[in-house]
Interface confidence: medium
Amino acid sequence: MTAGRRMEMLCAGRVPALLLCLGFHLLQAVLSTTVIPSCIPGESSDNCTALVQTEDNPRVAQVSITKCSSDMNGYCLHGQCIYLVDMSQNYCRCEVGYTGVRCEHFFLTVHQPLSKEYVALTVILIILFLITVVGSTYYFCRWYRNRKSKEPKKEYERVTSGDPELPQV
């Protein structure tokens, strides 16, 4: 199948595609944490990995992280400085209530991460997203079958009776 044909198939169901995109962006908005370390809380982050998402590279990638060099002491105002090895850049892991490149901004209202409300909202949005995907797939398949049935010919015309084996030559 050509790329054009795939695109034609994907772009055909406009309403399902719109719902699909809406669901995806809602999910993305909730799960937009930039750095999610895979180190155990309280464990040394000298050498572990993290899931990173940057503005330059919107894809989530798994990278190695270590502590920043000593000359970066004090760089992060309210947080821990970590060095993203694969991306060759420093990053501040802010303390609760702080944000910004160097953890310089303070939140007046602080919610504990992964509160019950947050988990519930995430679960609801994931369910909505899955319903959207299933619904979109169903309506797309129905549309595609209807379009195919209206076509005057199959992709390959049957022109003779089937002869899988030939008679004596």
Epitope: Y156, E157, R158, V159, T160, S161, G162, D163, P164, L166, P167, V169
Partner: antibody, heavy 118, light 111 residues
Framework: VEESGGRLVTPGTPLTLTCTVS????????MAWVRQAPGKGLEYIGF??????TYYATWAKGRFTISKSSSTTVDLKIITPTAEDTATYFC????????????????WGPGTLVTVSS | QVLTQTPSPVSAAVGGTVTINCQAS????????LAWYQQKPGQPPKLLIY???KLPSGVPSRFKGSGSGTQFTLTISDLECDDAATYYC????????????FGGGTEVVVK
Amino acid sequence: VEESGGRLVTPGTPLTLTCTVSGIDLSTFAMAWVRQAPGKGLEYIGFISLSDATYYATWAKGRFTISKSSSTTVDLKIITPTAEDTATYFCARVVGDSSGYPNTFHPWGPGTLVTVSS
Amino acid sequence: QVLTQTPSPVSAAVGGTVTINCQASQSIHNSDFLAWYQQKPGQPPKLLIYRASKLPSGVPSRFKGSGSGTQFTLTISDLECDDAATYYCQGTYYSGGWYFTFGGGTEVVVK
């Protein structure tokens, strides 16, 4: 499978060749026409399917017409013969796979010679 | 769609082996809708191989077809005097309709 109707014709005079089959019903088989100029290779002209749909080689469109005149005969009409149409014309059954998609010609008739000359 | 046969002519001694190549300018339908025919002077073509490698009943196993897509080969082993003939490959294509193309033919001379 046997062809007939080949003869000497003058340029521009339409000529119809007939392919007669025995032992098979043309409502279940496709039949093709292939020609061979003296000392040259085989050249596919076109074929007629079991549903009477006709398919022609690009070069043959508008120059030939294939039709079923009965349940046992297939005709090839050379609309406006020229000297280049001088050849032996073969009729062959189109053999399909289990899906009915065509892939082979078998069996072939002995051929009929058409000479176009003034 | 063009089928190019090489070499032509080809000669070999009795008992020998000849190989004929057939190259398609674009992929054959289903990658294997290719047939080989043998034609002797004054006779219609005779089917030797269909679906690239299948042998119809009645054709000696000395004839072997191989290949897929755009490159195909007919190999005749244990050559006999009766094998002297012209060999043609024929491909099937689909492009909004069915099309057939024959190769230019390869003459086999048996010494």
